[in-house]
Interface confidence: medium
């Protein structure tokens, strides 16, 4: 799996999307986990509703929310009030029994303010390193609250 980079600004919300084959993963719950080091375990942060049919309901764990469009095949994770400590490597997972398939590897980058943001063309230098060849930057610098989303007060 190649790593997809999602960039957000400290204090704002970041939305991460993980597309998948809806037929292949039919009936499977999904999860968002944080990779502990480059070879360490992936620690579960939040998972979709215990009842797969209710996967569209947003579930929160602290400042992280998850919701799954099982028909369209898109898992969406929202990191609210993004902070420096949210930076790091994550995975979107599809669960089956005690096993988990990786849907997407995600690097969350937390920028100090919008002025620190640079265009993808400034970030990537194809051919410089193998790991950069298929790298992909998602621009999700900021957003408004989603319709129906509860505007939780910011936390430290």
């Amino acid at each position: 799996h190649n790593t997809t980079v999602f960039q957000g600004v400290a204090g704002q919300s970041l939305q991460v999307s993980c597309p998948y084959d809806s037929m292949k993963h039919w009936g499977r719950r999904k999860a968002w986990c944080r990779q502990l080091g480059e070879k360490g375990p992936c620690q579960r942060v939040v998972s979709t509703h215990n009842l797969w049919l209710l996967s569209f309901l947003r579930r929160w764990n602290g400042s992280t929310a998850i919701t799954d469009d099982t028909l369209g095949g898109t898992l969406t994770i929202t990191l609210r009030n993004l902070q420096p400590h949210d930076a790091g490597l994550y995975q979107c997972q599809s669960l089956h029994g005690s096993e988990a398939d990786t849907l997407r590897k995600v690097l969350v980058e937390v920028l100090a303010d919008p002025l620190d943001h640079r265009d993808a063309g400034d970030l990537w230098f194809p051919g410089e390193s193998e790991s950069f060849e298929d790298a992909h930057v998602e621009h999700s610098i900021s957003r408004s609250l989603l319709e129906g989303e509860i505007p939780f007060p910011p936390t430290s």
Epitope: T3, V5, Q7, A10, G11, R34, Q35, L36, G37, E38, Q83, P84, H85, A87, G88, L89, K105, L107, E109, L111, A112, D116, H117, R118, D122, L123, W124, F125, S129, S131, F132, A135, V137, T155, S156
Partner: antibody, heavy 118, light 107 residues
């Protein structure tokens, strides 16, 4: 186990640019999961965060130094670098590079002393 | 910027003593705090992260506590190798900031 080693001139003249490189061994900068930082310590003083870089090349800097600092990464050499322009005697310090894991500075270089003097 | 204030700035103690160092943040930082030990001429070494989690390989005589704005590093029984300077660091908001340090000296 990852090791970091700072290198660069120990003496820089005022108004010039300080340039340091951190060479990483025992782990790949481009593997993701970490970000790479510079921190300095003025003689007999506390620690000051300069900034960090992700393997993708994007950076976050300390606002107090932002106008003068540039951190870059060279994944082919497994190195990241610091440039600090228009230095003065106040920039005399020990400069450390470090690997950051979930916001914690778990691996450090041994530090390199940089003196700004004419 | 979040200011991190350590106290005391220095403490004299004997081997076997219980030593407590405090760190106060100028605003709430939840549990996003670390403690480092630094010996002369050496780089800092991570002791405690997330306010109370002991870093691998660090002796259990070191412990951390606190949340919000007030944090404590405790050395339950001071050993000769513990004489050093200790720093706290917040990782809640940019810029990352460190405390001014507490020097633990031999009495």
């Amino acid at each position: 186990q990852v090791q970091l080693q700072e290198s660069g001139p120990g003496l820089v003249k005022p108004s010039q640019t300080l340039s340091l490189t951190c060479t990483v061994s025992g782990g790949s900068i481009s593997s993701g999961g970490y970000y790479w930082s510079w921190i300095r310590q003025h003689p007999g003083k506390g620690l000051e965060w300069i900034g960090y870089i992700y393997y993708s090349g994007s950076t976050v800097y300390n606002p107090s130094l932002k106008s003068r600092v540039t951190i870059s990464v060279d994944t082919s050499k497994n190195q990241f670098s610091l440039k600090l322009s228009s230095v003065t005697a106040a920039d005399t310090a020990v400069y450390y590079c470090a690997r950051v894991s979930s916001s914690w500075y778990k691996a450090w270089g041994q530090g390199t002393m940089v003196t700004v003097s004419s | 910027d979040i200011q991190m204030t350590q106290s005391p700035s220095s403490v004299s103690a004997s081997v076997g003593d219980r030593v407590t160092i405090t760190c106060r943040a100028s605003q709430g930082i939840s549990s996003w705090l670390a403690w480092y030990q630094q010996k002369p001429g050496k780089a800092p070494k991570l002791l405690i992260y997330a306010a109370s989690s002991l870093q691998s390989g660090v002796p259990s005589r070191f412990s951390g506590s606190g949340s919000g704005t007030d944090f404590t590093l405790t050395i339950s029984s001071l050993q000769p190798e513990d004489f050093a300077t200790y720093y706290c660091q917040q990782a809640s908001t940019f810029p990352i900031t460190f405390g001014g340090g507490t020097k633990v000296e031999i009495k």
